[in-house]
């Protein structure tokens, strides 16, 4: 039975040209996290394997930095970066947990962080 919960940074906004940290946290389970995949719609951004380290997709290598921790830093943001991002936790023995973050990249200098929320 999967008892874990993914907590994410929820709906966030950031300025064009700036950077943002995408973070998820898995709680309420003793399952071992073997890997976290970061995806945007149909694209793979990065993989953080607990043992092997990081894979950064070449399409994003100039704008994505690994970390902090299992998170991912997006740099040099453009309006086209607006959209849904997913953290996919591969765990043993539970299986897969998925968290969702919605990022809005704003033209203006006003970019406020949204509230945190949980996805069971």
């Amino acid at each position: 039975m999967m008892t874990g919960t993914i907590e994410t940074t929820g709906n966030i906004s950031a300025e064009k040209g700036g950077s943002i940290i995408l973070q998820c946290h898995l709680s309420s389970t003793t399952a071992q996290v073997t890997q976290v995949n970061w995806e945007q719609q149909d694209q793979l951004l990065a993989i953080c394997n607990a043992d092997l380290g990081w894979h950064i997709s070449p399409s994003f290598k100039d704008r994505v930095a690994p970390g902090p921790g299992l998170g991912l830093t997006l740099q040099s943001l453009t309006v086209n970066d607006t959209g849904e991002y997913f953290c996919i936790y591969h765990t043993y023995p539970d299986g897969t947990y998925t968290g969702r973050i919605f990022l809005e990249v704003l033209e203006s200098s006003v970019a406020e962080h949204g509230a945190r929320f949980q996805i069971p």
Epitope: T34, Q35, N37, E39, D42, Q43, L44, I47, N49, A50, D51, L52, G53, W54, H55, I56, S57, P58, S59, K61, P66, H90
Partner: antibody, heavy 119, light 107 residues
């Protein structure tokens, strides 16, 4: 230039262990992991596992967990793969390979080590 | 484990032919796929990474495409040195797995 030089061919009896080495030169381990892949005669490629020299972490194919042990001696830039409780179907060519820089494809391979398990 | 199924398992072609090899993953692996070339008695060589990026020094006649579960390696004009076995590999999740291989033979 990048080189991965593996130890020589081995002939072992069933139940024995074998330890294959892979000496790396021409690059640093940072941002990379070292992997082992085997190929039975006339067959395809099978990933045994990988080792991250930076963190000391290792990831194994469950098929080999408990029988394969991956290590690295950073001081001499050498990776090792030990396989215990050998069976006849472990007869194969064993390759070491390194992952690309911050990628999980395998961009350089050793020349291969033939391990023959026979009574 | 994710299964990678290549087709065909072998093919005969002539120099100058356009050759297409397909690889189907048993689940969505996004673009986490590489292609390798192996000649008899030799170690595999990386051709394509992340589904469509040509590795350094690989001739432009080799190209890769696809995402999700369906991937293709294309050799636009087969050369004598291209007769070999080709493997796809996924690294979306461990254990990393390879296709069973496609042997390209001379017709």
């Amino acid at each position: 230039q990048v080189q991965l030089v593996q130890s020589g061919a081995e002939v072992k009896k069933p139940g024995a262990s074998v330890k294959v080495s892979c000496k790396a030169s021409g690059f640093t381990f940072t941002g990379r992991s070292m992997h082992w892949v085997r190929q039975a005669p006339g067959q395809g490629l099978e990933w045994i596992g990988g080792f991250n020299p930076n963190s000391g972490g290792s990831s194994y194919n469950q098929k080999f967990k408990g029988r394969a042990t991956l290590t690295v001696d950073k001081s001499i830039s050498t990776a090792y793969m030990e396989l215990s409780r050998l069976r006849s179907d472990d007869t194969a060519v064993y390759y070491c390979a390194r992952s690309s820089y911050y990628r999980f494809d395998l961009d350089y391979w050793g020349q291969g080590t033939t391990v023959t398990v026979s009574s | 484990d994710i299964q990678m199924t290549q087709s065909p398992s072998s093919l005969s072609a002539s120099v100058g032919d356009r050759v297409t090899i397909t690889c189907k993953a048993s689940q969505d692996v996004k673009t986490a796929v590489a292609w390798y070339q192996q000649k008899p008695g030799k170690a595999p060589k990386l051709l394509i990474y992340s589904a469509s990026f040509r590795y350094t020094g690989v001739p432009s006649r080799f190209s890769g495409s696809g995402s999700g579960a369906d991937f293709t390696l294309t050799i636009s004009s087969l050369q004598p040195e291209d007769f070999a076995t080709y493997y796809c590999q996924q690294h979306y999740t461990t254990p990393w797995t390879f296709g069973q291989g496609t042997k390209v033979e001379i017709k």
